[in-house]
Interface confidence: low
């Protein structure tokens, strides 16, 4: 779970150990604030749960890529 230390800065202190199926993911946001101890990705699941993940891991990168492709509408 992400922690809001001093709103509006949200940080992750631990990452999930489990790979989450992309079908369960609704969106993500990157955490890059220098106020946080580590860079992170926070996934929001389809049931609105927020999960901290390591952006250096392949499954995280691939999940972000999948979500990006869902939201990018091709130009006509």
């Amino acid at each position: 779970q992400p922690d809001a230390i001093n709103a509006p800065v949200t940080c992750c202190y631990n990452f999930t150990n489990r790979k989450i199926s992309v079908q369960r993911l609704a969106s993500y946001r990157r955490i890059t604030s220098s106020k946080c101890p580590k860079e992170a990705v926070i996934f929001k699941t389809i049931v609105a749960k927020e999960i901290c993940a390591d952006p250096k891991q392949k499954w995280v990168q691939d999940s972000m890529d999948h979500l990006d492709k869902q939201t990018q509408t091709p130009k006509t």
């Epitope: 250096k56 891991q57 392949k58 972000m64 890529d65 990018q72 130009k75």
Partner: antibody, heavy 117, light 107 residues
């Protein structure tokens, strides 16, 4: 901290092959992608390809397809790039890099490959 | 393949100057852009990713902006250690491609 240490400089004859190694420390290579980028003297950067060390799935720039082989040994945390049918235009510094989502946050020190008859 | 055009190819500036480097993609890269700094004989160093996100440890005088096909790297107040070559790189799709580089020299 993350460190990528590459093998030493090589001088090769045209038509031969070269194999460059990249040993990683401070990270689990099976959790990330390892990429290879080259830079000819006085020129810009050119992405060659990458490997997923976990399943050995590779992706290449089509211009290198068939001539480059990228492998990885997770037991030694080492990635390898082999380039065959060398020509003078392949004279360059070859870098390995840890890929994060398609960009590169840690780089090896580079390996100079000179192709000369 | 997505082509990246960087300009200018070189520029002369003084310490304290504001420097702007631009990068144009041949198609929308959806902010999938990174900037690197390279000094002679050294490997490139990641400065910015995702068009605007500063890599940890990179001074705040570096900033990135842009969207769609057009992106900019700005150095707000050039320091002696900033004289180097800068490259943009798209990571929208493989093959990942770099701009031709911008050499920042001392005036």
């Amino acid at each position: 901290q993350v460190q990528l240490v590459q093998s030493g400089a090589e001088v090769k004859k045209p038509g031969s092959s070269v194999k460059v190694s990249c040993k990683a420390s401070g990270l689990t290579i099976s959790h990330t992608y390892m990429h290879w980028v080259r830079q000819a003297p006085g020129q810009g950067l050119e992405w060659m390809g990458r490997i997923d060390p976990d399943n050995h799935n590779t992706k290449f720039d089509p211009k290198f397809q068939g001539r480059v082989t990228i492998t990885a040994d997770t037991s030694t945390s080492t990635a390898y790039m082999e380039l065959s049918s060398l020509r003078s235009e392949d004279t360059a510094v070859y870098y390995c890099a840890r890929g994060v989502f398609g960009f590169f946050d840690h780089w090896g020190q580079g390996t100079t490959v000179t192709v000369s008859s | 393949d997505i082509q990246m055009t960087q300009s200018p190819s070189s520029l002369s500036a003084s310490v304290g100057d504001r420097v702007t480097i631009t990068c144009k993609a041949t198609e929308d890269i959806y902010n999938r852009l990174a900037w690197y700094q390279q000094k002679p004989g050294k490997a490139p160093k990641l400065l910015i990713h995702g068009a605007t996100s500063l890599e940890h440890g990179v001074p705040s005088r570096f900033s990135g902006s842009g969207s769609g096909t057009d992106y900019t790297l700005t150095i707000s107040s050039l320091q002696p250690e900033d004289f180097a070559t800068y490259y943009c790189q798209q990571f929208r799709s493989a093959p990942y491609t770099f701009g031709g580089g911008t050499k920042v020299e001392i005036k």
